[in-house]
């Protein structure tokens, strides 16, 4: 059975450079340990933005210096990416791995195009 991962096609970051989206996966089995990775695809290059491994029912824990935060609820992961700038506009792919128990499954979403617009600088006040 293939594992399907769904994510929104387009998300617009807010004025503070924060973008949130839901990554939902159709689990073929009863996973207890899940790893979620956010990847950015620019041209044909893929880089890791952030990753978290969590036990079902527990909170996602990203590294301290991660630009991502998130929460999980069943087969849904609510992801938030912070500190984005216009140059970070691109396709953000959600990858889900069911690490335990066997069998292992991996699924990849089609990607969320995140648009980031840098705020206009405030005009000088006299």
């Amino acid at each position: 059975k293939a594992m399907h991962v769904a994510q929104p096609a387009v998300v617009l970051a807010n004025s503070r450079g924060t973008a949130s989206f839901v990554c939902e996966y159709a689990s073929p089995g009863k996973a207890t340990e899940v790893r979620v990775t956010v990847l950015r695809q620019a041209d044909s290059q893929v880089t890791e933005v952030c990753a978290a491994t969590y036990m079902m029912g527990n909170e996602l824990t990203f590294l301290d210096d991660s630009i991502c935060t998130g929460t999980s609820s069943g087969n849904q992961v609510n992801l938030t990416i912070q500190g984005l700038r216009a140059m970070d506009t691109g396709l953000y792919i959600c990858k889900v791995e069911l690490m335990y128990p066997p069998p292992y499954y991996m699924g990849i979403g089609n990607g969320t195009q995140i648009y980031v617009i840098d705020p206009e600088p405030c005009p000088d006040s006299d």
Partner: antibody
Framework: QVQLVESGGGVVQPGRSLRLSCAAS????????MHWVRQAPGKGLEWVTF????????YYADSVKGRFTISRDNSKNTLYLQMNSLRAEDTAIYYC???????????WGQGTLVTVSS | EIVLTQSPGTLSLSPGERATLSCRAS???????LAWYQQKPGQAPRLLIY???SRATGIPDRFSGSGSGTDFTLTISRLEPEDFAVYYC?????????FGQGTKVEIK
């Protein structure tokens, strides 16, 4: 650039043990899952075993389960394969391979030959 | 376990001809989870196609992948001398990771 270099192959008698190593360089080793794949002489590719990022999760082909053990040392950027109770049918070139971000095996080592013979 | 069956076992063609290689899965494979590899004698396999149709870095555009579900195809539009090799399909969406038995593309 990404490099994977296997070592430890050789000729060994049936029932004996051998430990293969795969030295990784050119990338952040702990951010990638890794595999061993083997190829018997003149045959196709056979997946052998997988290890997760931190070494906590391991999966094995039925043909090696209970005999082979995969491990990794992220501080040394090295992947290992401990092979016990070797059989003639384990004779093969053993490759280590890196899982790319999107799942395929994007980099492979040059392989190390293991020959099990009396 | 997902069994991958490749056909034909051997393909005899001349340089400049088109090669069409087939890979059939015993159950559904997500299109994001199928790859093709090329292997030449004495060398390690090299990733050609991932996600069923995306070319790996440095792979020429004469190589293309297609398909979904259980039927996948690797096409080499015009065979170059260096393309004569063995080609393997692989699914990487679930354990155990599995490969097809390979298709040998040889010079006619």
């Amino acid at each position: 650039q990404v490099q994977l270099v296997e070592s430890g192959g050789g000729v060994v008698q049936p029932g004996r043990s051998l430990r293969l190593s795969c030295a990784a360089s050119g990338f952040t080793f702990s951010h990638y899952t890794m595999h061993w794949v083997r190829q018997a002489p003149g045959k196709g590719l056979e997946w052998v075993t997988f290890i997760s990022y931190d070494g906590h999760n391991k999966y094995y082909a039925d043909s090696v389960k209970g005999r082979f053990t995969i491990s990794r040392d992220n501080s040394k950027n090295t992947l290992y394969l401990q092979m016990n109770s070797l059989r003639a049918e384990d004779t093969a070139i053993y490759y280590c391979a890196r899982t790319g971000w999107l799942g395929p095996f994007d980099y492979w080592g040059q392989g190390t030959l293991v020959t099990v013979s009396s | 376990e997902i069994v991958l069956t490749q056909s034909p076992g051997t393909l005899s063609l001349s340089p400049g001809e088109r090669a069409t290689l087939s890979c059939r899965a015993s159950q559904e494979v997500g299109e994001s989870e199928l790859a093709w590899y090329q292997q030449k004698p004495g060398q390690a396999p090299r990733l050609l196609i991932y996600g069923a149709f995306s070319r790996a870095t440095g792979i020429p555009d004469r190589f293309s992948g297609s398909g979904s579900g259980t039927d996948f195809t690797l096409t080499i539009s015009r065979l170059e001398p260096e393309d004569f090799a063995v080609y393997y399909c692989q699914q990487y969406g679930s354990s155990p990771w599995t490969f097809g038995q390979g298709t040998k593309v040889e010079i006619k």
